[in-house]
Interface confidence: medium
């Protein structure tokens, strides 16, 4: 049997799990969190290659979440919006994993303390954290061969605080994913 996600062994660095993060919160339809190849994050009704995630413990109670197919890390902006990045930024892409008694987990940005939600119906630019924490059920996924680790330089989400939010003046310089609020 696999070690259950509630095991304290999984709270220490180096432990790796492959999971689908499933949510059935009343506020949204049932969905699996997926990190798409272009860096958008959404929910899929069914398990998909983009929703198979690698959860790796960085330190006790803190994990990184990597999309196995897309080699993108799940990251969160200070306003709560989620995106998938080719570059792991410890501040934007580290999540505290809180284990609930019923087998569900809650995830919070370690840096900002914001709860992890699937993108809702409102733009996060106007409605940063309208709900309580979303509960995710980690469902086991068979571990395929892992992709090569992502490179250091990567496109970043549009910088809303920038005068050139989509890097239209020049090529991407691999900006930090931190956002001007």
């Amino acid at each position: 049997h696999p070690i259950p996600d509630s095991s304290p062994l999984l709270q220490f660095g180096g432990q790796v799990r492959q999971r689908y993060l499933y949510t059935d919160d009343a506020q949204q339809t049932e969905a699996h969190l997926e990190i798409r190849e272009d860096g958008t994050v959404g929910g899929a009704a069914d398990q998909s290659p983009e929703s198979l995630l690698q959860l790796k413990a960085l330190k006790p109670g803190v994990i990184q979440i990597l999309g196995v197919k897309t080699s993108r890390f799940l990251c969160q902006r200070p306003d709560g919006a989620l995106y998938g990045s080719l570059h792991f930024d410890p501040e934007a892409c580290s999540f505290r994993e809180l284990l609930l008694e019923d087998g569900y987990n809650v995830y919070q940005s370690e840096a900002h303390g914001l709860p992890l939600h699937l993108p809702g119906n409102k733009s996060p630019h106007r409605d940063p954290a309208p709900r309580g924490p979303a509960r995710f059920l980690p469902l086991p996924g068979l571990p395929p061969a892992l992709p090569e680790p992502p490179g250091i330089l990567a496109p970043q989400p549009p910088d809303v605080g920038s005068s050139d939010p989509l890097s239209m003046v020049g090529p991407s310089q691999g900006r930090s994913p931190s956002y001007a609020s």
Epitope: D38, T40, K69, T70, Y83, P119, P155, P158, L166
Partner: antibody, heavy 117, light 96 residues
């Protein structure tokens, strides 16, 4: 600056195949997706599919599966779309566009395909 | 739709099911589409401040606060909360 340079206009016979190209410059080709979009004269935009050169993963609109095949050559930073079994319905302008976080942020100038006997 | 200079113009885009964000593009005849609004409400580089975007769920809109001649174009909305990415049919805005 970012540019997507598409191949020139094509005239093809019904039943034939054609391969359109889109050469990218001004950015790291493997860090973004390339989508292809169809626009018939006087009509709207229709997403055909997308390729991610870093992984060669492709995603298609179900409607264009079997019609379009997307490939990419990392060494030349060029994306290709092959259209097969051409009919008059395939006559259109085809755009390639760069995909960034769900948004098509740069577009090629378009390639006009005319299918006629 | 047709609008006089200085008039406020609002065009809407209705999704078949709830989507997280909407994106908008402007296209003029014989030209490629241009990125216009991303993540529902953010203006792409170079887009005049008279444009704005809003909406949530299945209902989104693009507004021109004060119509100018150069705004005459067709505007397309686009989503990718689900596959395939889909564009709206486009709204043609003309100047009176």
């Amino acid at each position: 600056q970012v540019q997507l340079q598409q191949s020139g206009a094509e005239l093809a016979r019904p039943g034939a195949s054609v391969k359109l190209s889109c050469k990218a410059s001004g950015y790291t080709f493997t860090n973004y997706g390339i989508s292809w979009v169809k626009q018939r004269t006087g009509q709207g935009l229709e997403w055909i599919g997308e390729i991610y050169p870093r992984s060669d993963n492709t995603y298609y609109n179900e409607k264009f599966k079997g019609k379009a095949t997307l490939t990419a050559d990392k060494s030349s930073s060029t994306a290709y779309m092959e259209l097969r079994s051409l009919t008059s319905e395939d006559s259109a302008v085809y755009f390639c566009t760069r995909s960034d976080y769900g948004f098509f942020d740069y577009w090629g100038q378009g390639t006009t395909l005319t299918v006629s006997s | 739709m047709s609008a006089s200079p200085g008039e406020r113009v609002t065009m809407t885009c209705s999704a078949g099911s709830s989507v997280s964000y909407m994106y908008w593009y402007q296209q003029k005849p014989r030209s490629s589409p241009k990125p216009w609004i991303y993540l529902t409400s953010n203006l792409a580089s170079g887009v005049p401040a008279r444009f704005s975007g809003s909406g949530s769920g299945t209902s989104y809109s693009l507004t021109i606060s004060s119509m100018e001649a150069e705004d005459a174009a067709t505007y397309y909305c686009q989503q990718w909360s689900s596959n395939p990415r889909t564009f709206g049919g486009g709204t043609k805005v003309e100047i009176k």
